[in-house]
């Protein structure tokens, strides 16, 4: 079942188990939806002379893309279903604007940590972008949470605004990203 | 769209050497590893590495170690495969391949057929 | 190395068959999984990654399954343009090796 935590005075509110961010810059503003709207994949809406929002119900915009914060505990794999199943992927950090960004929203939540789109088959291998992207660590750095009994995390999370490894099976909050053309 | 578009056949002597390349298009370059993979004639489809286009990193097959190079000039976004001291047995359809989600190739080259004939 | 065994080497199937081909590596590699078609002359396609996700553009009758060790590309219905070979790759550990690749032919 999915959490429904609402308020009128604080920042962010959780409604069907998603966070929304009440920030009124570029974003987009929440409505009281059913969650049968909230997972409905939706394209980019046209515009007929009318201003409508290219992202589905309870997702922010920023720049070229919708971002859903979603508060259902899962597995990395399972959180990347869940993206899929709303038309989306695991959150991809694109630029240093994107990074700051997720920061600012996640930071409000800073007992949470939250799932993006980047993991290895094991540490030999290189991380890899859920597209198939290279990753580069000039954008940021993975701060490694590996130990002797635990010695293999190969997915990636964000806390606060430090980005970790962790064993892919742990469950936790995920962010998924759907691009739109303009 | 995404094109990977490679040179033309080639006819080596043993001992020789071969390099083959692999322009890409319709997606940034850099973002994406390159594989290479081989197909000897009637036979399977083999491995042989992949070059990070944005780094130039790679990653060669033990089997090919010494005597493979993989190298890319970003600015025609081109990838190229060297191998050199050919022998007979590496007469194959060579393809270069752009990678996709879980490190599968999601986009293959037309492939370059290399004879290796005395 | 991990070495990828695939089984049948070969098939004879009609059109409109559900065919079953299992792979099998030599440890385990998770999900990291590939299955490709490919016809004779031709580059192979990707069909599935992930052990079981489909490559856009890829019709739904193909499916891939399992984890692990053991994998199963399915073909709910075969279609003539279906009669190829099919290959398994894991990208788990360098070098990321194929399967010998088993042949799917008109009965």
């Known amino acids: 079942t999915m959490a429904i935590w609402r308020s009128n005075s604080g920042s962010n509110t959780l409604e069907n188990g998603y966070f929304l961010s009440r920030n009124k810059e570029n974003h987009s503003q929440p409505t009281q939806s059913s969650l049968e709207d909230s997972v409905t994949p939706t394209k980019a809406v046209k515009t007929t002379g009318v201003l409508s929002s290219p992202c589905p119900p309870n997702w922010i915009i920023y720049e070229k893309s919708c971002y859903l914060f979603s508060m259902s505990l899962n597995s990395w794999d399972g959180s990347k279903r869940q993206c899929w199943q709303l038309g989306s992927n695991l959150l991809k950090i694109d630029s240093s604007n994107e990074l700051g960004f997720i920061v600012k929203q996640v930071s409000s939540q800073p007992d949470n940590s939250f799932w993006i789109g980047l993991s290895r088959p094991q540490t030999e291998v290189p991380w890899l972008w859920e597209d198939g992207s290279t990753f580069s660590s000039n954008l940021f750095q993975i701060r490694t949470t590996a130990t002797q009994e635990n010695p293999s995390p190969n997915c990636v999370w964000i806390h606060v605004s430090v980005i970790y490894d962790q064993l892919c099976s742990v469950p936790s909050y995920s962010i998924c990203e759907k691009k739109f053309s303009m | 769209q995404v094109q990977l578009v490679q040179s033309g056949a080639e006819v080596k002597k043993p001992g020789a050497s071969v390099k083959v390349s692999c322009k890409s298009s319709?997606?940034?370059?850099?973002?994406?590893?390159i594989h290479w993979v081989r197909q000897a004639p009637g036979q399977g489809l083999e491995w042989m590495g992949w070059?990070?286009?944005?780094?130039?990193?790679?990653n060669y097959a033990q089997k090919f170690q010494g005597r493979i190079t993989m190298t890319r000039d970003t600015s025609i976004s081109t990838a190229y495969l060297e191998l050199s001291r050919l022998r007979s047995d590496d007469t194959a359809v060579f393809y270069c391949?752009?990678?996709?989600?879980?490190?599968?190739?999601?986009?293959w080259g037309q492939g370059t057929l290399v004879t290796v004939s005395s | 190395d991990i070495q990828m065994t695939q089984s049948p080497s070969s098939v004879s199937a009609s059109v409109g068959d559900r065919v079953t081909i299992t792979c099998r590596a030599s440890?385990?590699?998770?999900?990291?999984l590939a299955w490709y078609q490919q016809k004779p002359g031709k580059a192979p396609k990707l069909l599935i990654f992930?052990?079981?996700s489909l490559q856009s553009g890829v019709p739904s009758r193909f499916s891939g399954s399992g984890s692990g060790t053991d994998f199963t590309l399915t073909v709910s219905s075969l279609q003539p343009e279906d009669f190829a070979t099919y290959y398994c790759?894991?990208?788990?550990?360098?070098?990321?090796?194929f399967g010998p690749g088993t042949k799917v032919d008109i009965e």
């Open positions: 391949a752009r990678n996709s989600g879980s490190y599968s190739a999601g986009y």
């Open positions: 319709g997606y940034t370059f850099t973002d994406y590893y």
């Open positions: 070059i990070n286009p944005n780094s130039g990193d790679t």
């Open positions: 440890q385990g590699i998770s999900s990291w």
């Open positions: 992930g052990a079981s």
């Open positions: 790759q894991q990208a788990y550990s360098f070098p990321f090796t």
